[in-house]
Amino acid sequence: IVLRPSRVHNSEENTMRALTLKDILNGTFSYKTFFPNWISGQEYLHQSADNNIVLYNIETGQSYTILSNRTMKSVNASNYGLSPDRQFVYLESDYSKLWRYSYTATYYIYDLSNGEFVRGNELPRPIQYLCWSPVGSKLAYVYQNNIYLKQRPGDPPFQITFNGRENKIFNGIPDWVYEEEMLATKYALWWSPNGKFLAYAEFNDTDIPVIAYSYYGDEQYPRTINIPYPKAGAKNPVVRIFIIDTTYPAYVGPQEVPVPAMIASSDYYFSWLTWVTDERVCLQWLKRVQNVSVLSICDFREDWQTWDCPKTQEHIEESRTGWAGGFFVSTPVFSYDAISYYKIFSDKDGYKHIHYIKDTVENAIQITSGKWEAINIFRVTQDSLFYSSNEFEEYPGRRNIYRISIGSYPPSKKCVTCHLRKERCQYYTASFSDYAKYYALVCYGPGIPISTLHDGRTDQEIKILEENKELENALKNIQLPKEEIKKLEVDEITLWYKMILPPQFDRSKKYPLLIQVYGGPCSQSVRSVFAVNWISYLASKEGMVIALVDGRGTAFQGDKLLYAVYRKLGVYEVEDQITAVRKFIEMGFIDEKRIAIWGWSYGGYVSSLALASGTGLFKCGIAVAPVSSWEYYASVYTERFMGLPTKDDNLEHYKNSTVMARAEYFRNVDYLLIHGTADDNVHFQNSAQIAKALVNAQVDFQAMWYSDQNHGLSGLSTNHLYTHMTHFLKQCFSLSD
């Protein structure tokens, strides 16, 4: 299936050019998406090209500027947030990145009624997180690990917590491991639907071991970065959840929400909080051994001024074949009765599907079914449920949006997106206005991305929000590679792959092959999305074939494939890449003397193990910021898939699955090892240990470090990195510069 046909015609051939590395590094062919910032059922905000904040009313067709670029520029604002009562806007400036999601910033409050910034009781700086209440214009913010509340922007703040301490106690924001591996947010506080209550998490990192690394900077002495970071088997953060009445917080104070007894009996995690009504909240908890999750629905007791979580409202989700959930345990989407909910979890056949839970999980009604997976529930209204899945035409790497009518019986299902722009669009996400009156569809490919606005009742397209015309024009004279997504059937395992082929691909010729691998649990690399990136260039200009393969452990194809890697990371992921390479060789157009593999992060781990597999298949390979031993990585992630590194649990496989244990096997391959010295996520320690093992084994290898760079190797390091890797591969494949 050729998903992105080359635009080469003989008459035009001489005017067309290949992609260059410069194109990629300059982002020449990057695309835009349009996500409306919904503020009601029929209105949204959008930042225009000239930086005005514009309010659009779909029904009247009118738009007007609510905040001028001049006001934005006056405080160098890079972001904004309108209060729900539309009286104020916060302006965010001095953005300073911390970890993946977290950052600090300076906030200014602009009063729309008088066109002036609020003076008096200004916010302190820098703030770690700030948000409006869902109704009105109360503000909650986190400063120096403590939470503050303002009844109005010009009011003085009420301090809710007092125990916040850098690297010790985190209130309303997650610590490193919760941010990266559990919540995937920069915040850990949640307003109730009408702003009556504020729930927040407190993370106590007092007993967590600290990772320390040098940040070289420009000073005479490097400074040391210290992060409480629990590695596999180490002491974990202690989490508590509190809820405070935001109207009169001084009387009752923050009330702790009780942890279910079956969870509290041993180490546990808090995984998410969902408000149902102002007086009902749903908390999800997870045992440290992450195969048991408990969803607990708690009610406010007016007489006690506290939160009651009856055992009858505890719902247990357990996996007997792997860990609970996919990458994360799914979150519930509550229906209008405020007690029943929809949730994605494995059905009896081992496929993740939508279930409706009214009383107990055992009595759950399955809403979707089939040998495919429901991926996300976007919205539940009185009569419809909108979700995404990869059902259509049995391609796991696609995403289409479906609507199930839940108001009628039996419920009927309609694919909203399947036939809209079938060739261009096979991978969608959606963004819904209040009550799903309208929604935006964002198509990511395989063709050029396009964002459209739709009527939530009829699904009719109202207008195109962004169609990337400039990109389309710019690509007209570019020889893009061909892409195909197909599958291999091997020993009852289906291996989906994406192959990126040079523009003038000829099956009778031989091409060098580069495998790009990630391969982490619950990941997916083979997706029907548009991209013009480094591997596009390698195919277009350097004539390489690039392949991405989703092997065992990857997502959205059922639990059999997903949980195959449970407790034995580093085995089947590698085997399946090798199996795929052998199949590719059998196709006849691969030069088997010129095969390479590369990956980043988990992909760096897999590529390293593949190179050290002793198969002789790979001539060379690159590992960027690889994990080298699961004992070095974060507890929450690692233990989910590997259990604990203890003798009575899974220590043996922790030891067997290291890259260092295979140092000898690197002797016959060219290996390029790359890492940032300030990687807070996969610590430089991982590559340092690989290098040490290779030196001790007297194995030659190449290495590159990036001083003061984190896991993303951003900025100028990106250019250097891809230039360096390109030289390495061209040398490996004997391609002239």
């Epitope: 008096g120 009781n121 303002k150 009844q151 109005r152 009011d155 003085p156 009420f158 301090q159 007092f162 125990n163 508590r240 109207t247 009169y248 917080p249 001084a250 009387y251 009752v252 104070g253 923050p254 009330q255 702790e256 007489d303 006690w304 001024q305 506290t306």
Partner: antibody
């Protein structure tokens, strides 16, 4: 009906110690924040200390920090204030009050006199 | 800390008269964090008003509170004999919570 009954006051020498108790009834004690507020003879009210329902969080006025310890026993519905290194300026009627930083119910108070 | 200054120190009035008590804060205090208490000789304080203007349970409607920012007022529309007492304002916004020095309402 909410009732708070303080006890344990009395005469103590400077540098001495005293433990005040407050027996609570008429409401669910365990989740409630509780406080101690004092009133020197003929003077105004001064907040002294507060404690969360679980006892996990405690708060003190600077004037007593390091000398006074607030605690509670939820099984006995009782609030305590352990007062060490007492000074003449600690002489006051000590009230037990329900609330964190504002107080909807108060006890009758117990008099603490620090004098040599 | 936030200092609350009450005035007058003493208010001498007859039963049936209107009493107006003032409380001024050294810095702005949101209404939600301002309370008034009544204390009679030998008794514990009693919550009268919370949130600057909301009457606590069982408090007669002759008691009313108003104000915002730094200036707050407690008004007793018609003094009853049992209303002669000391009245304290209290803020719970700043930490630590603080009280005014009190206004004594005495019989003229």
């Amino acid at each position: 009906e909410v009732q708070l009954l303080e006890s344990g006051g009395g005469l103590v020498q400077p540098g001495g110690s005293l433990r005040l108790s407050c027996a609570a009834s008429g409401f669910t004690f365990s989740p409630a924040y509780m406080s101690w507020v004092r009133q020197a003879p003929g003077k105004g009210l001064e907040w002294v200390s507060a404690i969360s329902g679980s006892g996990g969080s405690t708060y003190y006025a600077d004037s007593v920090k390091g000398r006074f310890t607030i605690s509670r026993d939820n099984s006995k519905n009782t609030l305590y204030l352990q007062m060490n290194s007492l000074r003449a300026e600690d002489t006051a009627v000590y009230y037990c009050a329900k609330g964190w930083r504002a107080f909807d119910y108060w006890g009758q108070g117990t008099l603490v006199t620090v004098s040599s | 800390e936030i200092v609350l200054t009450q005035s007058p120190g003493t208010l001498s009035l007859s039963p049936g008269e209107r009493a107006t008590l003032s409380c001024r804060a050294s810095q702005s205090v949101s209404r939600n964090y301002l309370a008034w208490y009544q204390q009679k000789p030998g008794q514990a304080p009693r919550l009268l008003i919370y949130g600057a203007s909301s009457r606590a349970t069982g408090i007669p409607d002759r008691f009313s509170g108003s104000g915002s920012g730094t200036d707050f007022t407690l008004t007793i529309s018609r003094l009853e004999p049992e209303d002669f007492a000391v009245y304290y304002c209290q803020q719970s916004l700043g930490y630590p919570p603080t009280f005014g020095q009190g206004t004594k309402v005495e019989i003229k």
